[in-house]
Structure formats: C-alpha cells, structure tokens
Amino acid sequence: ARNGDHCPLGPGRCCRLHTVRASLEDLGWADWVLSPREVQVTMCIGACPSQFRAANMHAQIKTSLHRLKPDTVPAPCCVPASYNPMVLIQKTDTGVSLQTYDDLLAKDCHCI
Amino acid sequence: ARNGDHCPLGPGRCCRLHTVRASLEDLGWADWVLSPREVQVTMCIGACPSQFRAANMHAQIKTSLHRLKPDTVPAPCCVPASYNPMVLIQKTDTGVSLQTYDDLLAKDCHCI
C-alpha cells in the first residue's frame, strides 16, 4: 500500500529520489572499478511523516507507535522500494569484465 | 550481502529486532480488530554504523557517501529484511473473519 504522496512538510522535504554525484574515490572503488569514473548515485532521502508513502502495514504501525513512544520507536525511514541495475567495468585477476549490479541504484522510494 | 554483525557501539546499540507491546488502541485498530487485544510488535531499531548488517551494495555506497557528506546523505537505516505473518480476528459487515497479514511483524533486520 503506497499511502499519501502529499508532503505535509513542504515541497521536496519528504522521502523521495535524489541524485548524488560520486567519484570512484568517493565510493572506495578506485582499486577494483575501471569505469565509469563517476557515478550518478540515486538514493532515497527525506522525512517520513505520518502515512507518507507507507510501504506496508508495518510502516503504519511504526508511525502509530512513534507518535506514542518517540524515544523508543523511531519514525519510518526512507528507503528504496526498487532498484535500477548498474553495469560496471571491473578489474579481475585475468583482465577486465562487465558486471551488472541489481541493488546499487535506487529507482523508487517508500517509508518503512 | 550481510556484512559484519559485530556492533562497534556496544551490545544492543546497533540495528536489531526489538519487541514493543502495543494495545489495539495504541495501534488505532480498536474499531476493526477484535483479537488479539494486545500485540507484541517486533520491529527493527538501532544504529547502522559502517557496514553493520549492510543489506546490499546500495547500503555500502550510502555508508561511504554519508561519511563524506553527512549533511546531505543520511546513514543507512535499520529496517526489516523479512517478516513473520500475523493473524487478526477482524470485524466485518457480516460478522468476523480471520485475516493473515504478511508484512506486519519484522522477523529479521538489516541496514539500508
């Protein structure tokens, strides 16, 4: 259940997809990745106010209990709902190879 | 990839399964659930320090970028890796029914 997509905190403040530019050095990949030299990393960032993009029943429960016990139960968290694959050219023992990673770039976000 | 399960912050401080006791009133379910009257809600709570229970490559990237840009990129977040089903006795228009929810109780946790 993808609940409300209206952000009560103002435009762009709630859980959504952001792009962060990162070099191989930033990612700690310089020693095993040849290309690309820079990655447009898509990730999920933003607040998860009550019922905003609630992923499932668990997220709805978490919202209710966070309201009651904010020191014990954290608010839901903005995480990937799905991923886009990414291809890297990697260094290997025998040379180089293409490797596809299915869990590297966020495609869509929700709160859980 | 489930990376390190050793918590550098001290016992019980990192992402793990917690149980929070909640009444139907706490959950806002009193008007549509008959039983159970109280739920032992299992949820994922705790910090996600570098590579602790990293769910996948995305979590590893997030850790690296959070170190570099802590104001822009949040640390990974402790969320359910899997769920246990839970059966509720619900009120319906015609009486009551058993309903199983697959996404209500966290079974296992990871950082993402």
Epitope: N84, P85, V87, L88 | -
Partner: nanobody
Framework: QVQLVESGGGLVQPGGSLRLSCAAS????????IGWFRQAPGKGREGVSC????????YYSDSVKGRFTTSRDNAKNTVYLQMNSLKPEDTAVYYC????????????????WGQGTQVTVSS
C-alpha cells in the same frame, strides 16, 4: 526518426550460434558506445557486452566471455553480437543501447534503446 533496431534472434539448439544486429537510423553510431543487454523472464536487465566508440575496445560479462563477440561496421551503421556455444541460460530478450559516454553503457540512463529481439536456446 532516431531509432535502434535489433534483429537476428530466434530459436537455436544448445551449442548453436546466432548473430544479432543492432542497426541505427537517424544518427551515426561512430560516436557512441554500444551496449548489449539481455533480460530473462522475471529477471533484471543484465549487461552482456560493450564496444567503445573511440578505439573499439570490447568488454564482456564473465557469463559470455569467450563465447560472444561484439563488433561494429561503421559503414553500415550497425553493431553485431556474435553468439557461439549457446546455452539454455542464454535464453532472453536481447537489447542494444547507444550512449555518448564511454563504456559501460548503463540501463538506467536515458539514451537510445532498441525494442529487443528474442533468443531462445532449447533442444
């Protein structure tokens, strides 16, 4: 109209060969890196090979290395994927994509895509 069109797919027995073509119209392939991808039922898109624009360097995934070869014929504005020693696990829809960045071509980036050609390896 700018487009990529794949052809050459079909049904082949294990151990057999196929040659896929990726023909461009409306733009010149010379300046583009060309990636071949495949998508098996219920799976994500996997990068199979890439040929760079400048020096024609080629890159392959471990799963096809030594069996698949990619080449380009700039005069025909076409890139080929020669597939030998085919296995049942090579069964998928095969796509080509063109991108102005160096290899690897990445599926989440907006660039030119073909519509795909089905390859089925079965006895």
């Amino acid at each position: 109209q700018v487009q990529l069109v794949e052809s050459g797919g079909g049904l082949v027995q294990p151990g057999g060969s196929l040659r896929l073509s990726c023909a461009a119209s409306g733009f010149t392939l010379d300046y583009y890196a060309i990636g071949w991808f495949r998508q098996a039922p219920g799976k994500g898109r996997e990068g199979v090979s890439c040929i760079s624009s400048n020096d024609g360097s080629t890159y392959y995934s471990d799963s096809v290395k030594g069996r698949f070869t990619t080449s380009r014929d700039n005069a025909k504005n076409t890139v080929y994927l020669q597939m030998n020693s085919l296995k049942p696990e090579d069964t998928a829809v095969y796509y080509c994509a063109a991108d102005l960045t160096p290899c690897p071509v990445n599926p989440s980036v907006d660039h030119y895509w073909g519509q795909g050609t089905q390859v089925t390896v079965s006895s």
